[in-house]
């Protein structure tokens, strides 16, 4: 069966029907359907006016305008808001009411496209394998990235989040039109990796998507990841404005000037330094989502009530931090180079800047504890990788899972750890699953380009596609049309269980207590350390070109929700990856060609992008009680500095960095909290209280009715910021 021309809100579209084998199965493929009008720089996306006749949707459209790998020219186009659809078809009737999976690509909010890199004439994000193996519809799309997608003045002049709004437009288009392609508009699953995983998370939290999303999967990135929210957007807007010759003294004039500046110039005005960095790479990525009071109405930690009815899977790769650690400390991948205590201490101190000397020292001590017993270079290098994995991915993901679980009504929560090792031959043997290594398996590359892979890779890919598509169908990764290797139990705050995904999976793949000591360290010990003053905490920016100016620490609150503590050691689920990763060739000596790049260009991986290194605080305890968020409204972003001098100061962090005292027993009583004017608020129990969603504050497109003053809205202070 085949669809032929399909009528959409824009007009008729015609794709290609690709036959699969001799049994009569096929897949209808539509590439390049516009879901919004050609963009205007630094403005919200607008509906597409439509067309007459039948649009031939047979080729991918250009990606959104972005810098090339060398960052000295651009590629892509401003007219880029297009989507692609894969619809599996059986022999007889055209498909109806299929689950829909919408992919959001990663790339540090800086690069990427809906089709991904081309390798062996197969695009990374080609949805065919998922669609046909899982019997689901797959949709991918482009959204604006870099300054054009995320530049913001932190106020109404340039509110930012244009790329997130593009994503929402695509999701809403799918909701309105996918029935005509045979999809079920009431069963839409978002999935994405790294910045895409964080985007998935943010879309579930935004009130704009109320009623649009049924399920979501975040791979190596969540809204709470420390690189996701820019708390000082004006600093970065001014950097670009200065580069392109716009005035920076008055935000309104600056905004008007930026809007009429050549978009290519805006794109090239921002460069991420990739070598000789004075600070960890994440400090240099500035154009990411912001809390705009509308699309993202408050700090994401305060918005989990909005995702209460959305089934959720989140996870990480076991060495997600490897690629970033190797940029921050190149010795990691070099057998002849050593990592010293001094090197690691410097790195740690850069991530823990708001906690000053004590923060650096205690963190260093916790992470180097094993070095006395095992001073080998392998152990030291693994420690560096583990440190960045924890901070950038693992701990934030665990908190996101705990928050989802705590606020969920009917929704289910699942956690995973992807551990199938990287196949990059230039990496040391000890390297596990690097950032973005999971993508190729989710998209079925071992089947699509088999020469690059081994049978064990196909085993991993088959399992992931089965779990992912079963989840899209039913909300339970174990139930659906596809057999799975072992039962994946839901995540609960009592068990913090996670599925470890490897080439051999069985009952022992369900695990608990992942890196408990480190999780507990970040959520309790580190958090309780006093915050240092602005003067002590302000990093000295690198000299030379302004591209290398670090993002100053920008968090507005050191306090994070402190969940029950007990000693169960609930394991966090690590976050997953950002697709900026380099190509992943096979190991082994088969001579097989390398596995395709997992990012979307040959670009070196651009790291996560937020404004601070600190992970939020996940639950650690065995009390069984879900983490109980405080109710204060500390989610508001700090007012960014307005002067043009030097690096912006570290924003104030409140009078008390002390976290609320977590419950210690299983009484279910809310924890006692400080009563002064610290940033911790009294903590009411949340559970299934049915907190209303947090709405946008403007007269936004599809905002739910705002909660009344006496709503029991669950709120938390901002995630820890280093």
């Amino acid at each position: 069966a085949k669809l032929g021309a399909v009528y959409t809100e824009g007009g008729f579209v015609e794709g290609v029907n690709k036959k699969l084998g001799l049994l009569g199965d096929s897949v209808d493929i539509f590439k390049g359907i516009p879901f919004a009008a050609p963009t205007k720089a630094l403005e919200n996306p607008q509906p597409h006016p439509g067309w007459q006749g039948t649009l031939k949707a047979k080729n991918f459209k250009k990606r959104c305008l972005q810098a090339t790998i060398t960052q000295d020219s651009t590629y892509g186009d401003e007219d880029c808001l297009y989507l692609n659809i894969w619809v599996p078809q059986g022999r007889k009737q055209v498909s109806r009411d299929l689950p829909v999976m919408i992919w959001i690509y990663g790339g540090a909010f800086l690069m990427g496209s809906g089709h991904g890199a081309n390798f062996l004439n197969n695009y990374l994000y080609d949805g065919e394998e998922i669609a046909t193996r899982g019997n689901v519809i797959v949709v991918t799309f482009n959204y604006r990235v870099g300054p054009l997608g995320f530049l913001s003045t932190g106020d109404a002049n340039l509110p930012g989040n244009y790329g997130l709004r593009d994503q929402h437009m695509a999701i809403a288009w799918v909701k309105r039109n996918i029935a005509a392609f045979g999809g079920d508009p009431n069963n839409i699953t978002l999935f994405g990796e790294s910045a895409g995983g964080a985007s998935v998370s943010l879309q579930t939290l935004s009130p704009y998507n109320k009623g649009l999303i049924r399920r979501a999967i975040s791979q190596s990135g969540v809204a709470l990841s420390p690189w996701v929210i820019q708390k000082n957007p004006l600093f970065w807007a001014k950097k670009v404005a200065e580069k392109v010759g716009c005035p920076v003294g008055d935000a309104a004039r600056m905004a008007q000037c930026l809007k009429v500046t050549d978009p290519r110039a805006l794109t090239l005005a921002y460069k991420v330094p990739l070598a000789g960095l004075e600070y960890p790479m994440l400090h240099y990525v500035g154009f990411v989502p912001v809390i705009d009071g509308d699309f993202i109405p408050a700090d994401p930690i305060n918005l989990y009530a909005n995702a209460a009815d959305i089934d959720y899977i989140a996870g990480t790769n076991n060495m997600d931090g490897h690629i970033f650690a190797s940029i921050d400390m190149p010795a990691i991948n070099k057998g002849n180079k050593k990592v010293t205590e001094e090197d690691f201490y410097k790195l740690v101190s850069e991530f823990t800047i708001t906690k000053g000397l004590r923060g650096a020292k205690t963190t260093f001590d916790v992470y180097t504890e094993s070095w006395a017993q095992d001073p080998s270079q392998e152990n030291k290098k693994k420690t560096v990788v583990d440190f960045e994995t924890d901070v950038l991915f693992l701990v934030p993901t665990e908190i996101a899972l705990a928050q989802h679980r705590a606020n969920a009504k009917s929704a289910k929560t699942y956690a995973y750890l992807f551990s199938h090792p990287s196949r990059m031959p230039v990496y040391p043997k000890w390297v596990g699953a690097d950032h973005a290594d999971d993508i190729q398996y989710v998209f079925g590359k071992p089947f699509a380009t088999p020469t690059g892979y081994r049978p064990q890779d196909r085993t991993v890919s088959k399992a992931m596609i089965a779990y992912w598509t079963n989840f899209a169908k039913t909300g339970d990764p174990n139930m659906g049309d596809s057999a799975v290797p072992t039962h994946w139990e839901p995540y609960t705050t009592e068990n913090s269980g996670y599925l470890e995904i490897t080439k051999k999976m069985g009952s022992s793949s369900m695990k608990r207590s992942l890196r408990t000591n480190f999780l507990r360290y970040w959520t309790l010990t580190y958090l309780a350390l006093p915050t240092v003053t602005d003067q002590e905490a302000t990093p000295v920016p690198p000299t030379g070109d302004s591209e290398a100016t670090p993002v100053p620490p920008t968090g507005d609150s050191e306090t994070a929700p402190v969940p029950p503590t007990g000693d169960s050691g609930a394991p966090p689920v690590p976050p997953t990856g950002d697709s900026g990763a380099p190509p992943v060739p096979p190991t082994g000596d088969s001579g097989a060609p390398p596995v395709p790049p997992t990012g979307d260009s040959g670009a070196p991986p651009v790291p996560p992008t937020g404004d601070s290194g600190a992970p939020p605080v996940p639950p650690t305890g065995d009390s069984g009680a879900p983490p109980v968020p405080p109710t204060g409204d500390s989610g508001a972003p700090p007012v960014p500095p307005t002067g043009d001098a030097g690096p912006p100061p570290v924003p104030p962090t409140g009078d008390s960095g002390a976290p609320p005292v977590p419950p210690t027993g299983d009484s279910g009583a809310p924890p006692v909290t400080p009563t002064g004017d610290s940033e911790t608020a009294p903590v009411p129990p949340t559970g299934d209280s049915g907190a209303p969603p947090v709405p946008p504050t403007g007269d936004s497109e599809a905002a739910p009715v705002p909660p009344t003053d006496d709503s029991k809205e669950a709120q938390m202070p901002a995630v820890i910021r280093f």
Epitope: G4, A5, V6, Y7, T8, E9, G10, G11, F12, E14, P47, H48, P49, G50, W51, Q52, G53, T54, A172, W173, K175, R176, N177, I178, A179, A180, Y208, G211, L212, E701, A702
Partner: antibody, heavy 119, light 105 residues
């Protein structure tokens, strides 16, 4: 100027079929989609489906799938809407309507054809 | 299908009055159109893309809104404006509101 002229009223028995025509003039016939909308007595408007006169592509509302067929004759700039297995609740005025521009609203309408289904 | 809820279903007003009719979409939509229909006649396009006036339509008619909530406003009613008004969304399966009958008070 754009004109859409529909065929005359029809009276049909339950179970029969009806074929309503809509002749277009004043513009390039193959350049704009043609929709069919009906209105039962005293009721609101209900979209039936759409045809692209250029290539004959069609899309029908779920409710009418299997019972409706839209065709076109480019030589006479006419589109047709055939509805089969008629029942009394199909009694309505049937309108053809052309897109205004792009895939925009229904900017030009025929005068309507009353189809009465009665035993 | 996308649901379109129009309110009020009927409305009495006098010549010279300012009148507002609302239409709510669930879920949100891209574009909304408004039509006027007089008894025994075909509908006539008034407003398209939420706020754009179709050619030949008097400027006393205006439209606004986005996403889920839309309004049609007639700033100063004229005798010829008494009719039934419909909102309409275009998705892959277009739908109309149930109509608002505007009568003389």
């Amino acid at each position: 100027q754009v004109q859409l002229v529909q065929s005359g009223a029809e009276v049909k028995k339950p179970g029969a079929s009806v074929k309503v025509s809509c002749k277009a003039s004043g513009y390039t016939f193959t350049s704009y989609n043609m929709h069919w909308v009906r209105q039962a007595p005293g009721q609101g408007l209900e979209w039936i489906g759409v045809i692209n006169p250029g290539d004959g592509a069609t899309s029908y509302a779920q409710k009418f799938k299997g019972r409706v067929t839209m065709t076109r004759d480019t030589s006479t700039s006419t589109v047709y809407m055939e509805l089969s297995s008629l029942r009394s609740e199909d009694t309505a005025v049937y309108y053809c309507a052309r897109d205004y521009y792009g895939s925009s609203p229904l900017g030009y309408w025929g005068q309507g054809t009353l189809v009465t289904v009665s035993s | 299908d996308i649901q379109m809820t129009q309110s009020p279903s009927s409305l009495s007003a006098s010549v010279g009055d300012r009148v507002t009719i609302t239409c709510r979409a669930s879920p949100s939509i891209s574009y909304l159109n408004w039509y006027q229909q007089k008894p025994g006649k075909a509908p006539k396009l008034l407003i398209y893309a939420a706020s754009k006036l179709a050619s030949g339509v008097p400027s006393r008619f205006s439209g606004s809104g986005s996403g889920t909530d839309f309004t049609l406003t007639i700033s100063s009613l004229q005798p010829e404006d008494f009719a039934t008004y419909y909102c309409h969304q275009r998705s892959s399966s277009p739908t109309f509101g149930q109509g608002t009958k505007l009568e003389i008070k």
